[in-house]
């Protein structure tokens, strides 16, 4: 339905807090060096306008798009050049095009100062001195380090993040109260970063028809009693909402989604169980929770997928009738009987049936050709079972830590012209798989593990994409999106590496280790060993993990010294000697 | 200087047990890596197990992960190999090796070596 003034409609469908909070995070999003306060000017600016636009959709302007209002005030800031660069140009550019130019000089990685958290009664004294502008600068500043993040699931961590405040400031032990609520919220604010980020790249690197298979799978895994045409109308729907969150448009995005969780709710009878508690939450909850519901239990007594799909004789005809609905049919039958499978290995299925169907079905005798495909599937289902079951054992033997530190070293020597900051984080992130995951019992490792890793796995492939140094991620990034992570596994060591120059100050520690916390620590240690490999590719296993703890009882000897900056200083030199010696540096 | 003896050597059947010792003179035992290395006649001596100076982290040849246990008591001054499942191949002269770094230790270039002790599994 064509509104006068689009503007108008969004202000009035979102409410003014919703709408104001969504512009912050659209042009904190854009624009990721601008200072807070231009930031909320503008949006003032903005807000003041959609208001006349509201009192009359026919004033001046108000019939402008989106991204033209949206456009034309970004381009207003006076140091866009200088801050930005060449981002500056696409002021230059009509819509749709300026859009499309700030979206491509989104930063994954911005040079932003860490975000450092201040003492809980100086948080507590700006929480209540001016609850808005500190709610307001908690949306910048996620959304300007995050500038995928799920817009208007950010505006549900800013609701939890007020209600902790509200709560501890007013606790006995402060502190106590807020800090395990900033950390929960810190952590599962990073996932949901990196979940969206992958929706976004799913989208704009391998396009809609890539991004609805995906959905198809987990939408059918998660609502099995749901009928097809069920399922393939909220594919759709959440393929729209994404498609403009990615896009920059996140008003709509905002209100389509509220309209998704509103028809959920409304048809959930013909859609899962499971949705009762989430619907009867206010609409933030209410759709953080549907996004997050359990899989419903499956239809008792479901048939054979071989009669549909291998057996009956029209499989060409339906097939050549409408292929993308009969492989999304497929795709929804095979992903409703397996919640056991992870997404990317039911796409991968779909993969092959779709080849095998392309095959065969030009074949002399089609039948026969097709007949055996479920076969083909049993070595793709094997694959990510064995590997994560050797992975789990690993994790179990190892412990966190160590796990991160073997992985760290596997993908070091499989790719070590990345960054050394990009691979202790990427394997950092790689290892948390095992806590996350081993845990569960085995129906639900796979679709924990493997869709988990899929999330990581496209933090190095952005990443990496900002500043391209090896093909071989480049290769494994762009060929297949299903197939990415079975690309990355199967990398051996790269034998055309050049061992980087040894620098003795890469190796050289100081007394502010030992004030550090325990994450921080390991971080240090991380990039220690990612450095020793990339100057040391053939070293063993074993020379690294003695090397570490060469390096860990250093650090301890060092922390309890009462000189620890000499101790640091001639430790230091002597155990990179004992190094350079045994390994040859 | 650092003294290291080993004993518990002798001949096994297959499938059984033994329990390596090596004892060391000197009063900074504790912040020495110790490690196991053995010799097969006409072979190359190789790396079978170690044990850090913190918090016991221990490493193992992987021939050898999961049948082996090294141990350290620093009271005691001796550090263990206790070898479980005991196949043919494991037939060497067992050396036991110490020194400041675990680094050094596995890529066989400690400071001090004991004069080992013989194992023999037989079939």
């Known amino acids: 339905d064509a509104h006068k003034s689009e503007v108008a409609h969004r202000f009035k469908d979102l409410g003014e807090e919703n709408f104001k909070a969504l512009v912050l995070i659209a042009f904190a999003q854009y624009l990721q060096q601008c200072p807070f306060e231009d930031h909320v000017k503008l949006v003032n600016e903005v807000t003041e306008f959609a208001k006349t636009c509201v009192a009359d959709e026919s004033a001046e302007n108000c019939d402008k798009s989106l991204h033209t209002l949206f456009g034309d005030k970004l381009c207003t800031v006076a140091t866009l050049r200088e801050t930005y660069g060449e981002m500056a140009d696409c002021c230059a550019k009509q819509e749709p095009e300026r859009n499309e130019c700030f979206l491509q000089h989104k930063d994954d990685n911005p040079n932003l100062p860490r975000l450092v958290r201040p003492e809980v009664d100086v948080m507590c004294t700006a929480f209540h001195d001016n609850e808005e502008t500190f709610l307001k600068k908690y949306l910048y500043e996620i959304a300007r380090r995050h500038p995928y993040f799920y817009a208007p699931e950010l505006l549900f961590f800013a609701k939890r993040y007020k209600a902790a405040f509200t709560e501890c400031c007013q606790a006995a032990d402060k502190a106590a109260c807020l800090l395990p609520k900033l950390d929960e919220l810190r952590d599962e604010g990073k996932a949901s970063s990196a979940k969206q980020r992958l929706k976004c790249a799913s989208l704009q690197k391998f396009g809609e028809r890539a991004f609805k298979a995906w959905a198809v799978a987990r939408l059918s895994q998660r609502f099995p009693k749901a009928e097809f045409a069920e399922v393939s109308k909220l594919v759709t729907d959440l393929t729209k909402v994404h498609t403009e969150c990615c896009h920059g448009d996140l008003l709509e995005c905002a209100d389509d989604r509220a309209d998704l969780a509103k028809y959920i709710c409304e048809n959930q009878d013909s859609i899962s169980s499971k949705l009762k508690e989430c619907c009867e939450k206010p609409l933030l909850e209410k759709s953080h929770c549907i996004a997050e519901v359990e899989n419903d239990e499956m239809p008792a007594d479901l048939p054979s997928l071989a009669a549909d799909f291998v057996e009956s004789k029209d499989v060409c005809k339906n097939y050549a009738e409408a292929k993308d609905v009969f492989l999304g049919m497929f795709l929804y039958e095979y992903a409703r009987r397996h919640p056991d499978y992870s997404v990317v290995l039911l796409l991968r299925l779909a993969k092959t049936y779709e080849t095998t169907l392309e095959k065969c079905c030009a074949a002399a005798d089609p039948h026969e050709c097709y007949a055996k495909v479920f076969d083909e599937f049993k070595p793709l289902v094997e694959e990510p079972q064995n590997l994560i079951k050797q992975n789990c054992e690993l994790f179990e033997q190892l412990g966190e830590y160590k796990f991160q530190n073997a992985l760290l070293v596997r993908y070091t020597k499989k790719v070590p012209q990345v960054s050394t900051p990009t691979l202790v984080e990427v394997s950092r992130n790689l290892g948390k798989v095992g806590s996350k995951c081993c845990k569960h019992p085995e129906a639900k490792r796979m679709p924990c593990a493997e869709d988990y890793l899929s999330v990581v796995l496209n933090q190095l492939c952005v990443l990496h994409e900002k500043t391209p140094v090896s093909d071989r991620v480049t290769k494994c990034c762009t060929e297949s999106l299903v197939n990415r992570r079975p690309c990355f596994s199967a990398l051996e060591v790269d034998e055309t590496y050049v061992p980087k120059e040894f620098n003795a100050e890469t190796f050289t520690f100081h007394a502010d280790i030992c004030t550090l916390s325990e994450k921080e620590r390991q971080i240090k240690k991380q990039t220690a060993l990612v450095e020793l490999v990339k100057h040391k590719p053939k070293a063993t296993k074993e020379q690294l993990k003695a090397v570490m703890d060469d390096f860990a009882a250093f650090v301890e000897k060092c922390c309890k010294a009462d000189d620890k900056e000499t101790c640091f200083a001639e430790e230091g030199k002597k155990l990179v000697a004992a190094s350079q010696a045994a390994l040859g540096l | 200087q650092v003294q290291l003896v080993e004993s518990g050597g002798g001949l096994v059947q297959a499938g059984g047990s033994l329990r390596l010792s090596c004892a060391a003179s000197g009063r900074t035992f504790s912040s020495y890596a110790i490690g196991w290395f053995r010799q097969a006649p006409g072979k190359a001596r190789e790396f079978v197990a170690r044990?850090?100076?913190?918090?016991?982290?221990?490493d193992y040849a992987d021939s050898v992960k999961g049948r082996f246990t090294i141990s350290r008591d620093n009271a005691k001054n001796t550090v263990y190999l206790q070898m479980n499942s005991l196949k043919p191949e494991d037939t060497a002269v067992y050396y036991c090796a110490a020194d400041s770094y675990n680094v050094r230790l596995v890529t066989g270039e400690a400071d001090y070596w004991g004069e080992g002790t013989q194992v023999t599994v037989s079939s």
């Open positions: 044990v850090s100076t913190i918090a016991g982290d221990t």
